[in-house]
Structures are given as C-alpha cells and as structure tokens.
Amino acid sequence: GSVKVLHEPSCFSDYISTSVCQWKMDHPTNCSAELRLSYQLDFMGSENHTCVPENREDSVCVCSMPIDDAVEADVYQLDLWAGQQLLWSGSFQPSKHVKPRTPGNLTVHPNISHTWLLMWTNPYPTENHLHSELTYMVNVSNDNDPEDFKVYNVTYMGPTLRLAASTLKSGASYSARVRAWAQTYNSTWSDWSPSTTWLNYYE
C-alpha cells in the first residue's frame, strides 16, 4: 500500500550541534527500515546528508541530525523519502525553532541564614550565542504533597537560586528540577533536568 505522512515533520534545534525532527505516519511504520530524511543547508556547495529515523512510537518517527555551528540565517531543505517516493518536502530554520539543551548538574547546598542554594550548569559553552541568552524556571515540589509546589523564574545570568528554608515545610522531602528558555530566540522550553531531592529543615 502507499505510505503517507499523517502529521508532517516538526523540528527543533539546540542551536549548537543537533536538530531533531519528529513526524507521524498514517499507520505503524518501521522508521529506520522504510524511511530516510535528507537535509541540506540551503547554499550552493553544501553537502546533502541523510538521517536514519528511529521509532518513538509505532507510527511516530524521530530523526536526530548533526548540524554544525548554526548561524541565524541558516535554512535547511528537508526531504522525507520512502525509497524513491518523496513523501514530504519542506524547509527548517534552526534559529527560529530553538529548543535549548537541558541544564545539568542540579545540586542543593545548605547556605547561610537558613537558605538553600540551588545550583546548576549552563548547557552551552561560553562562545555559543545561547550561553548568555538563557533564563530558567525552577520547580520545587513536596514529594508527599502534590499541592505543595513552587515555581521560580530565574531571569538573571547566574545559574543559581537562593531559597529560604522557611518558605518550605520543615521536615518535608522536596525535589527540584530546572529547565531553560532563550527569550531572544523565542525558543520553546528545554526538557526538565533530572530532579534532585533534599530534606528541608529549619528551626
């Protein structure tokens, strides 16, 4: 039977090394066996690359494409193939579809004056455009009370958050996670970091 795309590819870039495209077929598909996504920078003399997709679900395919040293004006031509049949053709501008990398190494340290110091790492090297563009959202939740949670927006440069222990329940176990957003690129939010857990206490 004929192969058809139900939901056309949606793509995001981490704006440093990788772009990811995801699409849905109209029936369960072995993505890696049946499909190929070709991509090429829209410039004379650019290489034509091929991405082998993987299954995310029965009929959902995802392709991770190495994309080197992205610059704002870059546009990629994308072509989705099933053998010799062109299923879909489109273009993708990484700078217009940024999903930042996930912040890393979230840790919690006791600090002076009954505060907790939450620290994490900026996922971009200093020379990358996004390094100085990121703002963060920190989610702090009580492990035993789903209604007890707080969201903090960190809009200053440093990847840190000071949290007064008194704003949390004493003796309760809390978990924190962090995600990033690049305002000037109108990005989507990054994935959440892995959670880190600690026991809150104060006198």
Epitope: F43, M44, G45, E47, H49, D68, V71
Partner: antibody, heavy 117, light 107 residues
Framework: EVQLVESGGDLVKPAGSLRLSCTVS????????VHWVRQAPGKGLEWLGM???????DYNSVVKGRFTISRDNAKNTVYLQMNSLRAEDTAMYYC???????????WGQGTLVTVSS | DIVMTQTPLSLSVSPGEPASISCRAS??????LNWYLQKAGQSPRLLIY???RLQSGVPDRFSGSGSGTDFTLRIGRVEAEDAGIYFC?????????FGQGTRLEVR
C-alpha cells in the same frame, strides 16, 4: 578546535611527481568538503579542486588529469597527488575547509612546492 | 570560467578613514560572493560570505553589499591591522575563481 596542516612540499624536477597531505582535526571529513588552492609567488589565489564529504571530487580544468585528490578518513587526511609537474606549478599550496556557499572558513598554513631543474 | 575583476588593485588609507573595494563578476553569481584578507606571510582569512554575512570573529567595521555582478567590501574605519591583500571569490559555479587581489596599505 578546527585545524588543517599541510605537508609534503618540496623541490621537484619538471615532469616529476609529488604528493601533498592535509591532516585535519576538529571536524569530520565525511561532513565537510576540503579544497586545494594554490598561490604562485607574488600572485593571486587559484582553486585546484575539492573532495566532497561523500567522497566525490571536482577539479579545475587547468589541473584535471594531472592532479588527483583523495583522502583517508581513518587518518583524517586529504591528499593532492601531483603528476607531470611544470615550472608554472611552483606555488604555495593550501588546503581549506568548505563553509556556507563554497566559502573557505579554515585554511592550513600552506606548503611550498618548487618545480625547477 | 567566471572571471572576477577587482578595483582598485591597491589603495592607501589613513587609520580611521573608510575604505572600499569593488569586485565585478563576468556573469551573474547571485549573492555567492565571498571576501578574504591575506596578511603578509599568512593564509587567507574568510571575512564575509554570501555577499554580506560577517564571518564569526570578524569586526563589524567590515561590511559587504551587492548582487548579480557588482559587489563591494567596505571598511568603516580602517585600523592598522587591516593592512594586507583582499580577495573576492565567486562561489556560484565550479571552478571557484578569485579576484586578482587589492592591496590595502594603512599609512
């Protein structure tokens, strides 16, 4: 860090042969094309040819048939094999990496080839 | 092959003054025009690609314009470190071809 380093330049007699090497680091030869460009003493730049990431090659007609570009991915090295050399091939030979629109964003330091009897 | 012609072949500019170099292609090359600077004893360095896009790390006193067959490189305020030979290169068609070069002296 992206780097290209040429080697193999030498004094060679007319009609002789020479193989130049361009060893790269900081990028993959399967994803970027590499070009050879030469510059005769006190003169301008002349494009000789390129090897694409996929392995195919293109040449300038002035050297086609005499010069051959190849590569060894395992050694991260691109080669320029030069045969039937002439006095007018005397030049500094550069390898360079392709960027957007056939722009050459990283160049080696060059290796000098002198063809003289 | 596409012939690239640069003018002037040399110019002398005082620090802080502007400078301009023209490059003409023998046929339409759209916006596929790149500029390089080669300082004495060094390899060429990419300054501008695709007519007007500044290569990473290049000071914004450099700018490029044009399309089709006529292109211009401008330096807003020349500095001593800008001395060298400037080459234009067409990137529309193989073989790639370069202009003959323009020597900029900063006096």
């Amino acid at each position: 860090e992206v780097q290209l380093v040429e080697s193999g330049g030498d004094l060679v007699k007319p009609a002789g042969s020479l193989r130049l090497s361009c060893t790269v680091s900081g990028f993959s030869l399967s994803r970027y094309s590499v070009h050879w460009v030469r510059q005769a003493p006190g003169k301008g730049l002349e494009w000789l040819g390129m090897i694409w990431g996929g392995g195919s090659t293109d040449y300038n007609s002035v050297v086609k048939g005499r010069f051959t570009i190849s590569r060894d991915n395992a050694k991260n090295t691109v080669y320029l094999q030069m045969n039937s050399l002439r006095a007018e091939d005397t030049a500094m030979y550069y390898c360079a990496r392709t960027y957007r629109g056939y722009a050459l964003d990283y160049w080696g330091q060059g290796t000098l080839v002198t063809v003289s009897s | 092959d596409i012939v690239m012609t640069q003018t002037p072949l040399s110019l002398s500019v005082s620090p802080g003054e502007p400078a301009s170099i023209s490059c003409r292609a023998s046929q339409d090359i759209s916006n596929y025009l790149n500029w390089y600077l080669q300082k004495a004893g060094q390899s060429p360095r990419l300054l501008i690609y695709y007519t007007s896009r500044l290569q990473s790390g290049v000071p914004d006193r450099f700018s490029g314009s044009g399309s089709g067959t006529d292109f211009t490189l401008r330096i807003g305020r020349v500095e001593a470190e800008d001395a060298g030979i400037y080459f234009c290169q067409q990137a529309n068609t193989l073989p790639l071809t370069f202009g003959q070069g323009t020597r900029l002296e900063v006096r």
